[in-house]
């Protein structure tokens, strides 16, 4: 399945609007930093089917839209960038959708790989214990947002690996 | 690729200030902190401070609050240092160094360095 | 100001040896779960080169042999097997707090 052009511009974009969304100096929040155990080992590049790849970069960027489209991130982000981050993400989750339809055709593929999907889900399971933990507090925002751009960095180092082996 | 061209070597009288650039190219230039590193000749690196290129947002080392000014021009992709009353102390290499690993705080690219001098 | 303190100061080691390099901080620099400690290449005429993030992790392209350890104010960087090119002055860095500051460096010569 070849993502389209759009995709990796759209990625592009995503980055580029949560380096946006910082309203605070991260340097006022170096305390509050934290290792939130991101599942390298699912982004790595060992011997996965392309299908694993394409759901675990799904979820992914489904579990980031989750996390991005409650109510605290609504009241600590501005709301314009997010709406332009959701349209973004929309757009991803609809390329990726598309493309686990035509490597499987099944659409209850991502079942299939329910260890690496579990780890990711684990993962933002922490984060949101986090923000939880710290109150949604504006610097506990500051931390996980350079922590998403980290790991949407590293999905889209994967989505680059995926395109290149083809 | 990812580039950052500094600008060429400086000599200043004592109690001058001199002005170095460092132009970015193959990257997003206003989405990534830039760091200045201090280094006198045959000693080790000191931080400067960083500047955030995209809204201007500086983080400065106190010792070197009053000493340099980080400013960022993102038309021309270009950060610059302003280096006031200037003295001996000051004369080193000064490198430009792109943030790396968000809030690792770690530095990928270099700059080649702008060596300045001072003397009188 | 955290403080750096790297030892030795500099180090002969032959050729196919292990060379193993010291940071130790006056603060720590480790919290929940990352060790903000990094390492640097210098070699003479060059600019730093990064080998080594949060302690231990090696960074793209950097060869194997490089590999750090430690967290709190005790940090190693370790190579092994050492080869000629790796004559240079190694930095540690950390970024627990501001300032930002650096080891005063450990010159690597290869016997």
């Known amino acids: 399945c070849d993502l389209p052009q759009t995709h990796s511009l759209g990625n592009r974009r995503a980055l580029i609007l949560l380096a946006q969304m910082r309203r605070i100096s991260p340097f006022s929040c170096l305390k509050d930093r934290h290792d939130f155990e991101f599942p390298q080992e699912e982004f790595d590049d060992k011997q996965f089917q392309k299908a694993q790849a394409i759901s675990v970069l799904h979820e992914m960027i489904q579990q980031t839209f989750n996390l991005f489209s409650t109510k605290d991130s609504s009241a600590a982000l501005d709301e314009t960038l997010l709406d332009e981050f959701y349209i973004e993400l929309d757009q991803q989750l609809n390329d990726l959708e598309s493309c686990v339809m035509q490597e499987v055709g099944v659409i209850e593929s991502p079942l299939m790989y329910e260890d690496s999907i579990l780890a990711v889900r684990k993962y933002f399971q922490r984060i949101t214990l986090y923000l939880t933990e710290k109150k949604y507090s504006s610097c506990a925002w500051e931390v996980v947002r350079a922590e998403i751009m980290r790991s949407f960095s590293l999905s889209i180092n994967l989505q680059k690996r995926l395109k290149s082996k083809e | 690729q990812v580039q950052l061209q500094e600008s060429g070597t400086v000599l200043a009288r004592p109690g001058a200030s001199v002005k170095m650039s460092c132009k970015a190219s193959?990257?997003?230039?206003?989405?990534?902190?830039m760091h200045w590193v201090k280094q006198r000749p045959g000693q080790g690196l000191e931080w400067i401070g960083v500047?955030?290129?995209?809204?201007?947002?500086?983080t400065y080392n106190q010792k070197f609050k009053d000493k340099a000014k980080l400013t960022a021009v993102t038309s021309a992709n270009t950060a610059y240092m302003e280096l006031s009353s200037l003295t001996n102390e000051d004369s080193a290499v000064y490198f430009c160094?792109?943030?790396?690993?968000?809030?690792?705080?770690?530095?990928?690219?270099w700059g080649q360095g702008t060596t300045v001098t001072v003397s009188s | 100001d955290i403080v750096l303190t790297q030892s030795p100061a500099s180090l002969a080691v032959s050729l196919g040896q292990r060379a193993t390099i010291s940071c130790r901080a006056s603060k720590s620099v480790s919290t929940s779960g990352h060790s903000y400690m990094h390492w640097y290449q210098q070699k003479p005429g060059q600019t730093p080169k990064l080998l080594i993030y949060l302690a231990s992790n090696l960074e793209s392209g950097v060869p194997a042999r490089f590999s750090g350890s430690g967290s709190g104010t005790d940090f190693t960087l370790n190579i092994h097997p050492v080869e000629e090119e790796d004559a240079a002055t190694y930095y540690c860095q950390h970024s627990g707090e501001l300032p930002f500051t650096f080891g005063s460096g450990t010159k690597l010569e290869i016997k």
């Open positions: 500047i955030y290129p995209g809204n201007g947002d500086t």
């Open positions: 193959g990257y997003s230039f206003t989405t990534y902190w």
């Open positions: 160094t792109r943030n790396y690993k968000y809030d690792y705080y770690t530095m990928d690219y």
